[in-house]
């Protein structure tokens, strides 16, 4: 009952005279475990007997005996985890047909047939290739044989155009019960040049030899495969030449449907066949030429061909680098003359005549001079003649003014108040002067333009310059005035001491001044409106007190004479000339205030007063006044004072003070 | 044009090792396998073994199995092979020789190295 | 392993003689794709083994046209037409198509 089996196979297995079969086979019996298991080859069942018959390849029985098996077949199978894979090591022709698997459990049988096919020779194996192969584009060729044993080791190899190719090629078998296969995958990216070449997989034994092989034609769509060609083959022509370019197609496929031909990128009109014929050229054909050519898988575009036009040089033109140039700096002359080939000589021109030693397109002038400047031109010559030359550049040589020279136009000598009038020349300048400037700056007039008039000029405007200007300044040499004055900057200057004045010191005043002009000066000294000498230098031998007061000193000069300030006299002495003054006579009653002041004369004032009695015995006062009150009878008696200041001391003579009775005391007495 | 080259002689005591080398030119190195063999005077060709540069599948004679190592270097196209547990039975001249991937044949022969197994 | 017995062991000859070296296989060397690998090599006294003959019949490049094979399945000759003095040497014939690849004993071509 064909309902209680279930057994998977992989229908037929293929191998070849001399190698192996490997038949993976699992099994499924409804009730219950495998107890016989028979593999016949070509087995028919004898209706008569109710059983089948042939050649028995193996036999296994309950305990697992194979009483008259083949050596060379093997039953892989295992009743526990229901697999019945077998394997035949070698194989043989005559063993091709079917393989019957007789089947016996406790209460059912079962005949499953497995074909097989043993070629003579090794069967060739299949290459698959995708629908479409495509230039560059990652493809995958498989080759696929219907074959795999463990026990027969074989390998597929790739080749093109007979020779292997070492790309890494996957290569996977298969030995499971629904397939049995040996495949080789290998990834390829077909060039052009592949199209129509021999691609081959080989199946190879364990030694490397081939035992069968299958062949493909690749069929490698690619844009057109495109060369260029030039009649006469040299693409350099004369102007007036024929030339014609080819586009070979190499290869194409498909072929090819659309032709055109560009120069420098940029398509030809009108021009759609392989051949492109160009007459009488132009120096404007002069360029880059390619054809382009598609097919259904693109476009493909030529290699370049430069094609040049020769002509004779054009009607120059010269470039300079700079015009105006600046006197000094570098200039360029650079000769333009279109050419081809490229001019080899140059003739240039300056202002008409020929500049000699200079044959280059290009020549350069280090330090330009204002005799340079002019008319440039040049004549450029190739193979083919002598180019015209053109009307020429102008060079126009910019430099500072020269020679500036400054005049005083006014007479000499010039004093301190007067008007001076100044003027600036040159000698040449390019561009004109349009400005001049002055040093120093001052709030001057300029009448006129050059022309500077100062007023009222300052006794130190020594010396003036100016500078004549276009683009740039030239200054002239300054010019030194001269401008005379009376004598400045008069003051009173205490040479000796360093230090404050002492009564009794030698003391020198100095009479100094800044400047004069004319230099020949003469000196006065004056004290209260008293002329007191006539140096330089005011003496005193030794200075009294007297001696102080407000000095001034003159200096004159022939243009006229200057006071100094009025400068103090300071002399400090010791208290002098003290005196005790009464103001109550010299006679108080007693009762009364008697005061005595201590009168005195000093530089700086006394700061501290002492009074003394006549037994010279000091008092508790220190005071400038001394106030008995009330006065006594004892008080009377001579009395003097002692002033101080910095410098020093002074003493009172003696003074009396006589005390009398009041009328009281009298009366009492 | 196609070259192996093998140095002369290896002079080599009892139980050492020896690595021989054979420096190809001239052709595509990973195409072909290469094969050694060995020559001792009076006792013919024999052939030690083989292998594919390009994947290092090597195949030996039984006989030798345990006495030969064979690689390959593919950046300097070199071939090596390495003789372990030397005795005088390996005293001989061994050849390095390129076979043709077409008919299996030995068309190019290295001019061969002389080992000297000696104390 | 295969045996392949070369007959005779040496062979005395006169220059432009013919020569005749037999080369004997103990089994069949027809491969399974059908192609017989057994090749002729000389070597010369100092020299390694040079290629004359592949495939039973086949002439390497640059062999002289004197040189020739033939046989099949067990049976080999290699064939000399005129000897000349730089054919002399050792001979041996050799099979590829069982591994592992195996060598004639050799015949030693001389002059009488």
């Known amino acids: 009952d064909s309902s209680k089996w279930n057994i998977e196979h992989p229908g037929t297995i293929y191998a070849w005279e001399g190698a192996c079969v490997w038949v993976p086979c699992t099994y499924r019996v409804l009730d219950g475990a495998l107890e016989t298991f028979i593999l016949f080859h070509n087995p028919e069942y004898n209706q008569n007997m109710s059983k089948f018959e042939g050649t028995r390849l193996y036999e296994s029985t309950k305990d697992g005996k194979v009483p008259s098996g083949q050596k060379r077949v093997q039953f892989l199978g295992n009743k526990i985890n229901n697999n019945c894979t077998l394997s035949i090591h070698p194989v043989h022709v005559n063993d091709s047909g079917q393989l019957g698997l007789r089947m016996v459990s406790k209460t059912e049988k079962w005949m499953e047939r497995i074909h097989l096919n043993v070629s003579e020779r090794p069967f060739p194996p299949r290459i698959q290739l995708p629908p479409k192969l495509q230039e560059s584009q990652e493809v995958t060729l498989t080759c696929l044989l219907n074959f795999s044993c463990y026990g027969y080791q074989i390998q597929l190899q790739w080749l093109l155009e007979g020779v292997p190719m070492r790309q890494a090629a996957v290569t996977s078998t298969s030995l499971s019960t629904k397939s049995v296969f040996t495949r080789s995958e290998l990834k390829f990216s077909p060039q052009w040049s592949h199209h129509g070449k021999i691609v081959t997989c080989e199946l190879h034994d364990v030694d490397g030899k081939v035992l069968s092989e299958d062949m493909v034609q690749l069929n490698v769509k690619h844009t057109p495969k495109l060369t260029i060609e030039v009649t006469p083959n040299e693409t350099i022509v004369r102007k007036g030449d024929s030339v014609t370019m080819t586009c070979k197609v190499n290869s194409s496929n498909p072929e090819y449907t659309t032709v055109s031909w560009l120069k420098d990128g940029i398509p030809l009109k009108e021009q759609n066949t392989l051949m492109l014929t160009l007459h009488e050229v132009t120096k404007s054909q002069t360029g880059r030429y390619c054809c382009r050519v598609s097919n259904d898988v693109g476009p493909a575009t030529s290699e370049k061909v430069f094609l040049q036009v020769q002509y004779a040089p054009e009607p120059s033109r010269v470039q300079i680098s700079q015009s105006p140039a600046v006197e000094g700096s570098e200039v360029n002359f650079l000769c333009i003359s279109p050419a081809n080939p490229l001019p080899t000589n140059y003739t240039w021109y300056h202002n008409g005549k020929e500049v000699q030693g200079r044959t280059e397109k290009q020549f350069q002038i280090q330090k330009i001079l204002p005799w340079h400047a002019g008319t440039y031109s040049c004549e450029a010559e190739n193979i083919l003649g002598i180019g015209e030359r053109g009307p020429g550049t102008e060079l126009d040589v910019q430099y500072p003014p020269k020679k500036v020279t400054m005049v005083i136009e006014n007479p000499t000598p010039i004093r301190e108040g007067d008007t001076v009038t100044l003027s600036c020349n040159y000698s040449s300048s390019n561009p004109i002067v349009n400005h001049y400037e002055w040093r120093p700056r001052g709030a001057w007039e300029e009448p006129s333009l050059g022309v500077l008039k100062i007023q009222n000029i300052g006794w130190n405007n020594t010396a003036v310059a100016c500078a004549a200007c276009n683009n740039w300044c030239s200054w002239a040499s300054p010019v030194t005035l001269n401008v005379l004055y009376a004598p400045r900057g008069v003051r009173v200057r205490k040479i000796k001491p360093l230090s404050e004045i002492h009564s009794g010191n030698s003391v020198s005043l100095q009479c100094d001044f800044s400047s004069s002009h004319p230099k020949e000066v003469q000196f006065f000294w004056e004290k209260n409106g008293s002329l007191l000498g006539k140096e330089s230098q005011l003496n005193f031998d030794s200075i009294s007190p007297e001696d102080a007061g407000s000095y001034s000193c003159w200096v004159n000069n022939s243009i006229g004479q200057t006071a100094s300030k009025a400068w103090t006299l300071e002399v400090l002495y010791a208290p002098r000339r003290l005196r005790v003054s009464m103001s109550q006579g010299n006679q108080v009653m007693e009762g009364k205030t008697a005061t005595l002041t201590c009168e005195s004369d000093a530089n700086p004032p006394v700061y501290s007063y002492a009074w003394f009695d006549w037994n010279n015995q000091s008092l508790p006062y220190s005071g400038r006044m001394l106030r008995l009150e009330p006065v006594k009878v004892q008080h009377s008696g001579a009395y003097w004072c002692q002033g101080t200041n910095r410098v020093g001391k002074g003493h009172s003579p003696l003074i009396t003070l006589t005390v009398y009775y009041s009328p009281q005391t009298i009366g009492r007495r | 044009q196609v070259q192996l080259q093998q140095p002369g002689a290896e002079l080599v005591k009892p139980g050492a090792s020896v690595k021989l080398s054979c420096k190809t030119s001239g052709y595509t190195f990973t195409i072909y396998w290469m094969q050694w063999v060995k020559q001792r005077p009076g006792r013919g060709l024999e052939w030690i073994g083989r292998?594919?540069?390009?994947?290092?599948?090597?195949h030996y004679n039984e006989n030798f199995t345990t006495k030969v190592t064979l690689t390959v270097d593919e950046t300097s196209n070199t071939a090596y092979m390495h003789l372990s547990g030397l005795t005088s039975e390996d005293s001989a001249v061994y050849y390095c020789a390129r076979r043709d991937y077409s008919y299996y044949v030995l068309d190019y022969w290295g001019q061969g190295t002389s080992v000297t197994v000696s104390s | 392993d295969v045996v392949l017995t070369q007959t005779p062991l040496s062979l005395p000859v006169s220059l432009g003689d013919q020569a005749s070296i037999s080369c004997r296989s103990s089994q069949s060397l027809v491969h399974i794709n059908g192609d017989t690998y057994l090749h002729w090599y000389l070597q010369k006294p100092g020299q390694s083994p040079k290629l004359l003959i592949y495939t039973v019949f086949n002439r390497f490049s640059g062999v002289p046209d004197r040189f020739s094979g033939s046989g099949s399945g067990t049976d080999f000759t290699l064939k000399i037409s005129r000897v000349e003095a730089e054919d002399l040497g050792a001979y041996f014939c050799?099979?590829?198509?069982?591994?592992?690849?195996?060598f004639g004993g050799g015949t030693k071509l001389e002059i009488k």
């Open positions: 292998i594919d540069p390009h994947s290092g599948d090597t």
């Open positions: 050799s099979q590829s198509t069982h591994v592992p690849y195996t």
